[in-house]
């Protein structure tokens, strides 16, 4: 037994067929010794007296709110909440399973930046006698602080002769970091009540897997003179995190007609415009992702393309700019090729993703991902690499990054990636390897050194082992890779003469 | 299954035109763009053009531009390919190919042998 | 324009090797790049779109990456029968245009 809040206790029962339950000792709160009665619920049946009762809890018949008195005022409540575990396994009635991105999700959480705000939903079938709490924490084993709403009903459906009940809740980070390289996940916990039944719900996630931004907004759309074509622009969503040169969208411009199986014109770009082939009766689309971060796209923005005015909007900051190699040079030391380390720090990220593209979604994390990942370089909250960091100072960012690529780079190249299962060398985790020398060359040119971080003894004997650590190290890599692209974008966009 | 069947072998003299026809069965022939590639002896691939049966609009390469007419026929599901003021270098052989996405060729005709030769 | 560049010209495998093809583009083309396999008398036949999203009923063993400027199809295993000409296209815009071709030989 164990308190959920004051006054409310949570009983956990082996939930099998003639189970002896649990013995509970319940204590009236008063400094009163004698005369003192307890009943259960509504019923005045007199259940024992004493400034203790003993009960012993099977079923939710000896669960609810127990009360003392004495000479017909009341002393004090005890509410009696049971917790099911059936097979080892703790019960999840009150909520449905989602069942995507897998089984047995019961929670599911977004968030439109980086600002470390987001939102997690669940759903039901109840529709009354149902209370939930949320607490969330970014790690567990020396939790950083996450504030959380109360959760709401957000939304009802019908589904077949059920209604869907959908709730939802927003957190934030206290002291969230939007550039850093996330290394510990957020944790969030749902405690779900429903008359006398208690269940818990957990989600872990990093932000950056999350993410899933607005529609693009301010679709517009222009004809082109003596073609068929259109040029459509658009710009940013407003909540995206800035500045856009830093934090940048890739785009998918897609023309349909009302129905998916007509043909289409469909182009993918960096920029806030493209030209398309408009037709009549059909709609341009536009929808977003992380430029650097294979997480969800987002929603389809959409013109209907007989709407082809000739106004245009502005064309949103999105495109991170080309600029020269030779840049100026910050306190510290010498700059890079700014637009060099742009190109190459993309192509890592394209790399990162095609070595493993299911990385993202696997679930790892129960595996003791803290022994492993650990022990890898992060870029962390004061490394500098954040935009403000990069003008003050670029050194303290690029030494950070020129370390995790020396250390990814000696990773890809051990044991743990050479022995078995073997890989080719043109393999995408081939080219990978290649192009992280290539950019740390890039980064610190011959005669030049800066200290790096020494590599953990990962040695694992057996194969599995070796392909569960590729996939974990892979997976920080991709998360690595994206800030250092995301850093190099925007000092090709900002600080090249 | 979407099948493109193109029109036989042709010889032709310089300066004069060739008409390439290509017909298409196992879909509504208005649901897909038509486009055309050609392809000299021992060269690469070379897009001319597109044209949408559904409602004529047509997109040509400008080197083709003024030289190139593509039309259809949805009556017979049939695209034609017509080319003027042949010269030597035109000699290929000319694909038809149909898809629902416009910038991309999935399906293609088994290819017509145009000659330009004095 | 936008001018494809495929390297090698010839690339000359054993069958069960790897044989890793490259196609540059003259300007940023973000994903719009396409694959296609052609054999000798025969039209070519799409492999790859989008850089890398594969085709149904095309052997898993061709699979193509990158973004930007740089793309890679990669055949994984070479059978006999993937001994052809492979050519890359940009769809970022018009007018369309392929590269070169590379044609892939047995050693």
């Known amino acids: 037994i164990w308190e959920l809040k004051k006054d409310v206790y949570v009983v956990e029962l082996d939930w099998y067929p003639d189970a002896p339950g649990e013995m509970v000792v319940l204590t009236c709160d008063t400094p009163e010794e004698d005369g003192i009665t307890w009943t259960l619920d509504q019923s005045s049946e007199v259940l024992g007296s004493g400034k203790t009762l003993t009960i012993q809890v099977k079923e939710f018949g000896d669960a609810g709110q127990y009360t003392c008195h004495k000479g017909g005022e009341v002393l004090s409540h005890s509410l009696l909440l049971l917790h099911k575990k059936e097979d080892g396994i703790w019960s999840t009635d009150i909520l449905k399973d989602q069942k995507e991105p897998k089984n047995k999700t019961f929670l599911r959480c977004e968030a439109k930046n980086y600002s470390g705000r987001f939102t997690c939903w669940w759903l039901t079938t109840i529709s009354t006698d149902l209370t939930f709490s949320v607490k969330s924490s970014r790690g567990s084993s020396d939790p950083q602080g996450v504030t959380c709403g109360a959760a709401t009903l957000s939304a009802e459906r019908v589904r077949g002769d059920n209604k869907e009940y959908e709730y939802s809740v927003e957190c934030q980070e206290d002291s969230a970091c939007p550039a850093a390289e996330e290394s510990l996940p957020i944790e969030v916990m749902v405690d779900a009540v429903h008359k006398l039944k208690y269940e818990n719900y957990t989600s872990s996630f990093f932000i950056r897997d999350i993410i899933k931004p607005d529609p693009p907004k301010n679709l517009q759309l222009k004809p082109l003179k003596n073609s068929r074509q259109v040029e459509v622009s658009w710009e940013y969503p407003d909540t995206w995190s800035t500045p856009h040169s830093y934090f940048s969208l890739t785009f998918c411009v897609q023309v349909q007609g009302k129905s998916k199986r007509e043909k289409k014109d469909r182009v993918a770009t960096d920029k806030t415009s493209a030209t398309v082939i408009c037709r009549k009766n059909a709609s341009i689309s536009v929808r977003a992702q992380d430029r650097y971060y294979s997480s969800s796209w987002s929603e389809w923005a959409s013109v209907p393309c007989s709407g082809s005015g000739s106004s245009r909007g502005g064309s949103g900051s999105g495109g991170s700019g080309g600029g020269g190699s030779k840049l100026r040079a910050v306190p510290g030391g010498s700059s890079p090729a700014w637009t060099q380390c742009q190109q190459l720090s993309q192509k890592l990220c394209t790399l990162a993703w095609s070595a493993h593209p299911l990385v993202g979604h696997m679930d790892l994390r129960e595996e003791g991902d803290e022994e492993t990942t650990n022990d890898v370089p992060h870029i962390q909250c004061g490394d500098g690499c954040d935009p403000q960091g990069l003008r003050d100072n670029s050194q303290f960012c690029l030494q950070r990054i020129h370390q995790g690529l020396i250390f990814y780079e000696k990773l890809l190249g051990s044991d743990i990636f050479t022995g078995e299962p073997s890989l080719l060398p043109d393999s995408p985790v081939g080219q990978l390897h290649a192009s992280l020398l290539g950019l740390s060359q890039l980064l610190q040119p011959e005669g030049h050194h800066w200290e790096t971080q020494q590599i953990p003894s990962l040695s694992p004997s057996q194969p599995w082992q070796r392909l569960l650590l590729r996939f974990k190290i892979l997976r920080s890599l991709q998360a690595f890779v994206a800030v250092a692209a995301r850093v190099f974008a925007h000092g090709a966009a900002t600080l090249s003469p | 299954q979407v099948q493109l069947v193109q029109s036989g072998a042709e010889v032709k003299k310089p300066g004069a035109s060739v008409k390439v026809s290509c017909k298409a069965s196992?879909?509504?022939?208005?649901?897909?763009?038509l486009h055309w590639v050609r392809q000299a002896p021992g060269q690469g691939l070379e897009w001319m053009g597109w044209i949408d049966p559904e409602n004529g609009d047509t997109e040509y390469a400008p080197k083709f531009q003024g030289r190139v007419t593509m039309t259809t026929d949805t009556s017979t599901s049939t695209a034609y390919m017509e080319l003027r003021s042949l010269r030597s270098d035109d000699t290929a052989v000319y694909y038809c190919?149909?898809?629902?996405?416009?910038?991309?060729?999935?399906?293609w005709g088994q290819g017509t042998m145009v000659t330009v030769s004095s | 324009e936008i001018v494809m560049t495929q390297s090698p010209a010839t690339l000359s495998v054993s069958p069960g090797e790897r044989a890793t093809l490259s196609c540059r583009a003259s300007q940023s083309i973000s994903i719009n790049l396409h694959w296609y396999q052609q054999k000798p008398g025969q039209a070519p036949r799409l492999l790859i779109y989008?850089?890398?999203q594969s085709i149904s009923g095309i052997p898993a063993r061709f699979s193509g990456s990158g973004s930007g400027t740089e793309f890679t199809l990669t055949i994984s295993s070479l059978q006999s029968e993937d001994f052809a000409v492979y050519y890359c296209?940009?769809?970022?815009?018009?007018?369309?245009?392929f590269g070169g071709g590379t044609k892939v030989e047995i050693k």
């Open positions: 190919n149909a898809n629902k996405e416009l910038r991309y060729f999935d399906v």
């Open positions: 196992g879909y509504t022939f208005t649901d897909y763009y």
């Open positions: 989008f850089a890398s």
């Open positions: 296209q940009q769809s970022n815009s018009f007018p369309l245009t």
